[in-house]
């Protein structure tokens, strides 16, 4: 029995619902009473949802899963996963048995966009060209881990003296803090780009130095 799932991972935003597509080709005269359908986690074999003996056996996965009962007879064995969490990320296997047997695995990639970075500067008072300052770019509650890039006002990448740390919170979402240590020129813009590699989402923050007096309110 041929079971089909998408080759590409299913990307779902944290907190939204995701559909893990799975289909089979029922033979003429097929009856749901003949169908055994099992969704399980590929790695641990933990049961997620099942259909057997003509009945939906329900969710075994935090009551956040559902089938599409009206579409089963047409060979649609897709699984709806509600309120996606970071912990849901991984591979799900769809097992279909009628007389014959088939299975396929679909990957769920969880993502969350990063917030607009907040920029802080220290020292932030009485600065002069030549001072060494640390510019911190902070962006919150994203997933997966971000890629962080720094550049000057001309778009030239700033790679030296950058330290980036990422910490996961209780929900598994990351807060990213990237620190650029730089010697100030007379004028200049320092920009930070926080990229979500899955969503290809870029969040920008920048701080501009416009000569003396050099004070740096965070950008709105």
């Amino acid at each position: 029995l041929e079971v089909q799932v998408p080759e590409d991972p299913v990307v779902a935003l944290v907190g939204t619902d995701a559909t893990l597509c799975c289909s089979f080709s029922p033979e003429p005269g097929f009856s749901l009473a003949q169908l055994n359908l099992i969704w399980q986690l590929t790695d641990t074999k933990q049961l997620v949802h099942s259909f057997a003996e003509g009945q939906d056996q329900g969710s075994a996965y935090a009551n956040r899963t559902a089938l599409f009962p009206d579409l089963l007879a047409q060979g649609n064995a897709s699984l709806r996963l509600q309120r996606v969490r970071v912990a849901d990320e991984g591979s799900f296997t769809c097992f279909v048995s009628i007389r014959d047997f088939g299975s396929a695995a679909v990957s769920l990639q969880v993502a969350a966009p990063y917030s607009k970075p907040s920029m802080t500067l220290e020292p932030n008072k009485d600065l002069r060209p030549g001072d060494t300052v640390t510019i911190t770019c902070s962006s919150y509650r994203g997933y997966p881990e971000a890629e962080v890039f720094w550049q000057d006002g001309q778009g030239v990448p700033l790679t030296g003296n950058v330290t980036t740390s990422q910490m996961a919170n209780e929900q598994g979402l990351f807060d990213v803090h990237s620190v650029l240590r730089v010697v100030l020129g007379a004028n200049g813009t320092y920009s930070c780009l926080v990229r979500n590699p899955v969503l290809q989402q870029d969040a920008h923050g920048s701080v501009t130095i416009t000569g003396q007096p050099m004070t740096f309110p965070p950008e709105a």
């Epitope: 220290e122 020292p123 008072k125 002069r128 060494t132 300052v133 640390t134 007096p213």
Partner: antibody, heavy 119, light 108 residues
Framework: EVQLQQSGAELVRPGASVKLSCKTS????????IHWIKQRSGQGLEWIAR????????FYNEKFKGRATLTADKSSSTVYLQLNSLKSEDSAVYFC????????????WGAGTTVTVSS | DIVLTQSPAIMSASPGEKVTLTCSVS???????LYWYQQKPGSSPKLWIY???NLASGVPARFSGSGSGPSYSLTISSMEAEDAASYFC?????????FGSGTKLEIK
């Protein structure tokens, strides 16, 4: 009220080192620069360097680079000036100086520490 | 380095006389960071004028400051005995911060 309390006078031998202290109070220590100024007897004032205790960021006058070191101790809100390889021309009064023009205009000097370099 | 040249080095003034001290800068400075200090023997310098023309707290109104690059001045409209002191101009606009060599003002 911003206050700067400097350590007592020092008599040191040529070639030796000395560490002067400036204990601060009355403001957020980590949020403002502290400067050090040198004044030889009956002469003008020379800016040595400054330090921002929040990040230990420093900037030195080239003339004093290598022989003067500024450090800050956050636990005691104290800034230190260490002078190495002392010579007779280092004999002077050394002042610590709080100055800002950023969110308020303020200017406070310590009473000064007299350093005498003599054999 | 920015050189601050003060003149005269020493001057005497009679009570009631108008006095002008000058400070010439070798290259441009931001006038917000041009300060004047008064110092009396055995004491720390005291901020007298900040930002070229603003009188520090407690400074008598007979003092005034003015100027723009390359010349700045401190003026006493009517000299008094208590004004006898050394006066230093100071720029902390560009590194290294620099002081003028001072003017010693004496009372006649």
């Amino acid at each position: 009220e911003v206050q700067l309390q400097q350590s007592g006078a020092e008599l040191v031998r040529p070639g030796a080192s000395v560490k002067l202290s400036c204990k601060t109070s009355g403001y957020i220590f980590t949020s403002y620069w502290i400067h050090w100024i040198k004044q030889r007897s009956g002469q003008g004032l020379e800016w040595i360097a400054r330090i921002y205790p929040g990040t230990d960021s420093t900037f030195y006058n080239e003339k004093f680079k290598g022989r003067a070191t500024l450090t800050a101790d956050k636990s005691s809100s104290t800034v230190y000036l260490q002078l190495n390889s002392l010579k007779s021309e280092d004999s002077a009064v050394y002042f610590c100086h709080f100055i800002t023009a950023s969110d308020w205009y303020f200017d406070v000097w310590g009473a000064g520490t007299t350093v005498t370099v003599s054999s | 380095d920015i050189v601050l040249t003060q003149s005269p080095a020493i001057m005497s003034a009679s009570p009631g006389e108008k006095v002008t001290l000058t400070c010439s800068v070798s290259s441009s400075v931001n006038s917000n960071y041009l300060y004047w200090y008064q110092q009396k023997p055995g004491s720390s310098p005291k901020l007298w004028i900040y930002g070229t023309s603003n009188l520090a707290s407690g400074v008598p109104a007979r003092f005034s400051g003015s100027g723009s690059g390359p010349s700045y001045s401190l003026t006493i409209s009517s000299m008094e005995a208590e004004d006898a002191a050394s006066y230093f101009c100071y720029q902390w606009s560009s590194y290294p911060f620099t002081f003028g060599s001072g003017t010693k003002l004496e009372i006649k």
